[in-house]
């Protein structure tokens, strides 16, 4: 309830997360002409990044692109890039929608597509959809713990969500441990209505938010985070233009002498965490 | 760094074949694009042949249904094909890989009489 009598202020807050969990990736592998079941692991490292602000990344599916070089090679035939000859072609262009610069050739990219060629790391990204169901579909059971500290310097008042009684085994739950900071990505998901294994395909954003709503005054002081979750990005990813959340990264390697990469197009949760409320003191 | 060494330039009569190799070293040709370029007296070295890592490739018009780039890249080599030469074939022939860098042979000269 609103305290007239009180004098108010903002929250001022610092936010640190940290993501647990290990996931098995099964997928068919192709070396060499023979395809084999590849059993990759992946841990932390793995699969979150560090992002500036209150947010962290979960990556939850992924595109690779292996064994790229910088040289020079007929561009993938995505709709309107094919060629038929060299005027459709302009040296030194690079199309934003390209890989890489234009030679000015059109060139054969298969036996009967052709398109232009380009300088690139080669050969250029497929357009391949998300893999469904999602590689990293089990990153629905990791966990985060969200260490989160305030403050209220014009009542000189600092505290932090984690409590000293607290139990490093917990998972939060909105009724039976509302003040656990441990959270389990599924639940997360659940309490905001939505279906992670479905939003994992493509990536998307989901919301944290803390409030703090509290009292200062000493005979009914009262400071504790209430916990919230709600998708943040547009959910309709058949409506919308650029559907769920994706980056591009790569590993770069050297063999036989020449460098070269492996290109990941990377979906995945981005959780962004916002800390919002304020004290009260008369 | 890449090397690369051409051989089987020489002198043919119009209507004749030959056959070029470039033979790479520093590393596999199998990771990028190799070329064959061409220096006729007085004129700009111009793009023959290119083969791709995937296997496809390129022809300057002038040549195209003559001249035939393949690679064998067990032997780490790449070969032109010049079948019913003619005199306007005549220049030197440089083998050009790209990865990263532009690494070019030293040329081998291809002479043909009419």
């Known amino acids: 309830s609103d305290k007239l009598y009180q004098r108010k202020e903002p929250v001022i807050s610092s936010v640190h997360t940290k993501v647990k969990g290990i996931a098995e990736v099964t997928e068919n592998v192709t070396e060499g002409g023979v395809t084999k079941l590849g059993h990759s692991i992946f841990d932390t490292a793995d699969y979150t990044f560090p992002l500036q602000g209150n947010s962290f990344f979960v990556m939850t599916n992924y595109v690779k692109s292996e064994g790229q070089v910088q040289t020079l090679c007929p561009e993938y035939p995505r709709r309107g890039a094919q060629c038929s000859s060299d005027r459709r072609c302009k040296k030194g262009w690079m199309d934003p929608q390209s890989k890489g610069i234009q030679t000015g050739r059109c060139v054969p990219y298969d036996k009967t597509r052709k398109t232009c060629e380009v300088s690139a790391w080669c050969p250029t990204e497929e357009e391949k959809e998300a893999p469904r169901p999602a590689l990293l579909r089990s990153a629905e059971n990791f966990t985060v713990l969200i260490k989160n500290n305030i403050h209220f310097p014009g009542h000189n008042y600092t505290t932090r969500n984690i409590l000293p009684t607290m139990n490093g085994s917990c998972t939060f739950h909105k009724t039976w441990d509302p003040q656990c900071s441990i959270f389990r990505l599924g639940d997360i998901f659940q309490e905001a209505g939505e279906n992670f294994t479905e939003v994992a395909v493509q990536g998307g954003i989901m919301g944290i938010e803390i409030y703090w709503d509290c009292n200062l005054d000493s005979w009914s002081h009262h400071c504790r985070p209430r916990y919230s979750f709600r998708r943040l990005d547009d959910k309709n990813t058949d409506e919308s233009f650029v559907p769920g959340y994706n980056f591009r990264y790569a590993k770069y390697y050297k063999e036989n002498n020449v460098e070269k990469r492996t290109l990941i197009k990377a979906f995945g949760i981005r959780f962004d965490i916002l800390v919002f409320g304020t004290g009260g003191k008369f | 760094k890449v090397q690369l060494v051409e051989s089987g330039g020489g002198l043919v009569q119009a209507g004749g074949s030959l056959r070029l190799s470039c033979a790479a070293s520093g590393s596999p040709i199998s990771s990028y694009a190799m070329g064959w370029y061409r220096q006729a007296p007085g004129k700009p070295r111009e793009l023959v042949a290119r083969i791709y890592t995937g296997g496809t490739a390129w022809y300057e018009d002038s040549v195209k249904g003559r001249f035939t780039i393949s690679r064998d890249n067990a032997q780490n080599t790449v070969y032109l094909q010049m079948n019913s030469l003619k005199s306007e074939d005549t220049a030197v022939y440089y083998c050009?890989?790209?990865?990263?860098?532009?690494?070019w042979g030293q040329g081998t000269q291809v002479t043909v009489s009419s």
């Open positions: 050009h890989g790209r990865v990263r860098y532009d690494y």
